[in-house]
């Protein structure tokens, strides 16, 4: 090996990386209520609508103060790989009722992949444990029926509002303690 | 200028021990993630063992296991490798690295050797 | 053996575009890791060259890019230098080790 000699800075660090994950997730949170919103107006929701194969919803407000770095970050990657396998699963599976949703879909669906890998990169770069994501545990076959189609987009867009809502919350507060 | 400088390397017989330390300025070294990675004469890299930004997860190969020790301290910006049962086949040039890895340390050789 | 296979050797002369393949499996790449890149120079230690798949550094040049699908990964290099003349390895995160594992490395002539 030859003299010491320094290396140029990369181009993120563990700090500014937390800071990109916090604003690429508001800005994905943005996009989920928008595009709830679209769907409850084209397609009137009739009261609440659920999968079994999404994700349980890791936090609640109650639990935000006990929160821990390593937990906090491999939960959301994990809940985030199942929520993004889900829109890709829709935009496959989606009748020609939610064609015309298509290229918000593909926005949400490349977003979520951007902040997969930022979550990623930044648990890389602090050492953390990362888990193998799961596969889902319901396997995905194809929806009953166009309304079947139609009520699983409810529950994927909602169930994913909720859990980008206790992402930022969450990823702020740990900002305070790297 | 992001800087890692290895020392402790050296000439050691089988069975016995080094301890290496790395020197890190330049960045925040709290905030990362710290790895040995080694390189035998002639051959690649070979992740040898990683502790999280806070030292509470520390992990290694399994070649390694239970022979060798890694240690931080954030106070002094340094990492540490404690290797003790020292074998022919741990002779490397021994790097420590930051983060994925985006930083490198010049190396430091351990030769094991009779 | 590597967790994660290159190709032994590559070359290409000046101008030339090269690409050198990185090959892993589902329990690595597949599940959803992502991919970096180093170049060893001869006699120097290891840099990064392309992290999170295919995001540079500031400094590498942009001859040099990095692409992943499903399994495996790849780095090109355009517009071949001889000062590119060097042993590249990818690595990607491994949860079975908690770590990263790295390919065996290519070793890239310029003609």
């Known amino acids: 090996p030859g003299p010491p000699a320094g290396s140029p800075r990369v181009s993120s660090d563990p700090r500014a990386d937390l800071d990109s994950a916090v604003l690429l997730t508001r800005s994905l949170l943005a996009d989920t209520r928008q595009l709830a919103a679209q769907m409850r107006d084209k397609f009137p929701a009739d009261g609440d609508h659920n999968l079994d194969s999404l994700p349980t919803l890791a936090m609640s407000a109650g639990t935000l103060g006990s929160l821990q770095l390593p937990g906090v970050l491999t939960r959301l990657r994990v809940d985030l790989m199942s929520y993004f396998r889900h829109v890709q699963w829709l935009r496959r599976a989606a009748g020609p009722s939610l064609k015309t949703l298509e290229p918000e879909l593909g926005a949400l669906q490349a977003r979520l992949e951007r902040l997969l890998r930022r979550l990623q990169l930044l648990m890389s770069r602090l050492a953390l444990p990362q888990a193998a994501p799961d596969q889902p545990a319901v396997p995905l076959g194809p929806p009953a029926s166009a309304w079947g189609s139609i009520r699983a987009a409810h529950a994927i867009l909602g169930g994913l509002h909720l859990t980008l809502d206790w992402a930022v919350r969450g990823l702020l507060l740990l900002k305070t303690r790297l | 200028e992001v800087q890692l400088l290895e020392s402790g390397g050296g000439l050691v017989q089988p069975g016995g021990s080094l301890r290496l330390s790395c020197a890190a300025s330049?960045?925040?070294?709290?905030?990362?993630?710290m790895h040995w990675v080694r390189q035998a004469p002639g051959k690649g890299l070979e992740w040898v063992a990683v502790i999280s930004y806070d030292g509470s997860y520390k992990y290694y190969a399994d070649s390694v296991k239970g022979r060798f020790t890694i240690s931080r301290d954030n106070s002094k910006n340094t990492l540490y490798l404690q290797m003790n049962s020292l074998r022919a086949e741990d002779t490397a040039v021994y790097y420590c690295?930051?983060?994925?890895?985006?930083?490198w340390g010049q190396g430091t050789l351990v030769t094991v050797s009779s | 053996q590597s967790v994660l296979t290159q190709p032994p050797s590559a070359s290409g002369t000046p101008g030339q575009r090269v690409t050198i393949s990185c090959s892993g499996s589902s329990s690595n790449i597949g599940s959803g890791y992502d991919v970096h890149w180093y170049q060893q120079l001869p006699g120097t230690a290891p840099k990064l060259l392309i992290y999170?798949?295919?995001e540079r550094p500031s400094g590498v040049p942009d001859r040099f890019s990095g692409s992943k699908s499903g399994t495996s990964a790849s780095l090109a290099i355009s517009g071949l230098r001889s000062e590119d003349e060097a042993d590249y390895y990818c690595?990607?995160?491994?949860?079975?080790?908690?770590?990263?594992?790295f390919g065996g490395g290519t070793k890239l002539t310029v003609l």
């Open positions: 690295a930051a983060g994925v890895p985006d930083y």
């Open positions: 690595a990607a995160w491994d949860p079975s080790l908690s770590g990263p594992v």
């Open positions: 330049g960045f925040t070294f709290s905030s990362y993630g």
């Open positions: 999170s798949n295919e």
